[in-house]
Amino acid sequence: QGQDRHMIRMRQLIDIVDQLKNYVNDLVPEFLPAPEDVETNCEWSAFSCFQKAQLKSANTGNNERIINVSIKKLKRKPPSTNAGRRQKHRLTCPSCDSYEKKPPKEFLERFKSLLQKMIHQHLSSRTHGSEDS
């Protein structure tokens, strides 16, 4: 049940990431740690790296408010889960600083990719027989 709630939150975050992708030109063009090809059991660790990253509005134009609201939603911490707690204790997961830094557009694309991976794993874990490759 708790894990389900988290994955539902991940699905909502995908929509927020997609909204922010429409405003990449209004974000500070800063390079941010962007995990990619995250190893199994390090997903929650990578997720927290995305949440900690200093994604910021460039404070230009009329989109500042909607951007700041979206960033705030992205950073809202999900309640702790057993899976999350287990992963926190994995010392083998890379530190946030060790991940390649990318500009906002690629950062958001990689964040979305991780969210999708986590949802797909969750969906597959509840199912037998439809996974092909």
Epitope: Q1, D4, R5, I8, R11, Q12, I14, D15, D18, E109, K112, S113, Q116, I119, H120, L123, S124, R126, T127, G129, S130, E131, D132, S133
Partner: antibody, heavy 117, light 107 residues
Framework: QVQLQESGPGLVKPSETLSLTCTVS????????WGWIRQPPGKGLEWIGY???????NYNPSLKSRVTISVDTSRNQFSLKLSSVTAADTAVYYC???????????WGQGTLVTVSS | DIQLTQSPSSVSASVGDRVTITCRAS??????LAWYQHKPGKAPKLLIY???SLQSGVPSRFSGSGSGTDFTLTISSLQPEDFATYYC?????????FGGGTKVEIK
């Protein structure tokens, strides 16, 4: 705004292979999941399967032995192949994008494929 | 496979009416339910995902609720462009499955 367009023959003979292509415009196929759904005349929607941008697939077990979905990132297209078709495979076939992995947020208009000799 | 049963199969309503469509799952699916609007010859349109989240660009007169096995799509004030067939879809496990559809017709 991403748009999807199905293409392929509207008539396929029984026992042959149905082949459809979906062309994606206004966005890149190199992220998200890309799926096929069909609707037989007068019936409901049936999920056939989907493929991720990295090439991993999930298929409906009821069709799995006959289905192949593939992606061509260079052409921004993905394809459906359904082998050994019968009249029961006559349907409107839709291609769709799943950004959220489990629901479909962009669809093509559909293409009717009739299986008949 | 998870079966989804929609009711009613069709409903006649007038512009301005409140319309409620229900979808029942054969087993618990938490909030993993989506709703679509489909008009003949057009591409289906995602309205609601994870039971109650409104898809970007969808008018606020559409709302979704429910969890577990029982879900509802509500159109608070029916507009002329809302006459269509509505489908629910479970997103809890593979194979992804759809309800049989509810046709909203003009009274």
């Amino acid at each position: 705004q991403v748009q999807l367009q199905e293409s392929g023959p509207g008539l396929v003979k029984p026992s042959e292979t149905l082949s459809l292509t979906c062309t994606v415009s206004g966005g890149s196929i190199s992220s998200d999941y890309w799926g096929w759904i069909r609707q037989p005349p007068g019936k409901g929607l049936e999920w056939i399967g989907y493929i991720s941008s990295s090439g991993s697939t999930n298929y409906n077990p009821s069709l799995k032995s006959r289905v192949t979905i593939s992606v061509d990132t260079s052409r921004n297209q993905f394809s459906l192949k359904l082998s050994s078709v019968t009249a029961a495979d006559t349907a409107v076939y839709y291609c769709a994008r799943s950004a959220g992995v489990a629901d479909f947020d962009a669809w093509g208009q559909g293409t009717l494929v009739t299986v008949s000799s | 496979d998870i079966q989804l049963t929609q009711s009613p199969s069709s409903v006649s309503a007038s512009v301005g009416d409140r319309v409620t469509i229900t979808c029942r799952a054969s087993q618990g699916i938490s909030s993993w339910l989506a709703w679509y609007q489909h008009k003949p010859g057009k591409a289906p349109k995602l309205l609601i995902y994870v039971a109650s989240s409104l898809q970007s660009g969808v008018p606020s007169r559409f709302s979704g609720s429910g969890s577990g096995t029982d879900f509802t799509l509500t159109i608070s004030s029916l507009q002329p462009e809302d006459f269509a067939t509505y489908y629910c879809q479970q997103a809890s496990s593979f194979p992804l499955t759809f309800g049989g559809g509810t046709k909203v017709e003009i009274k």
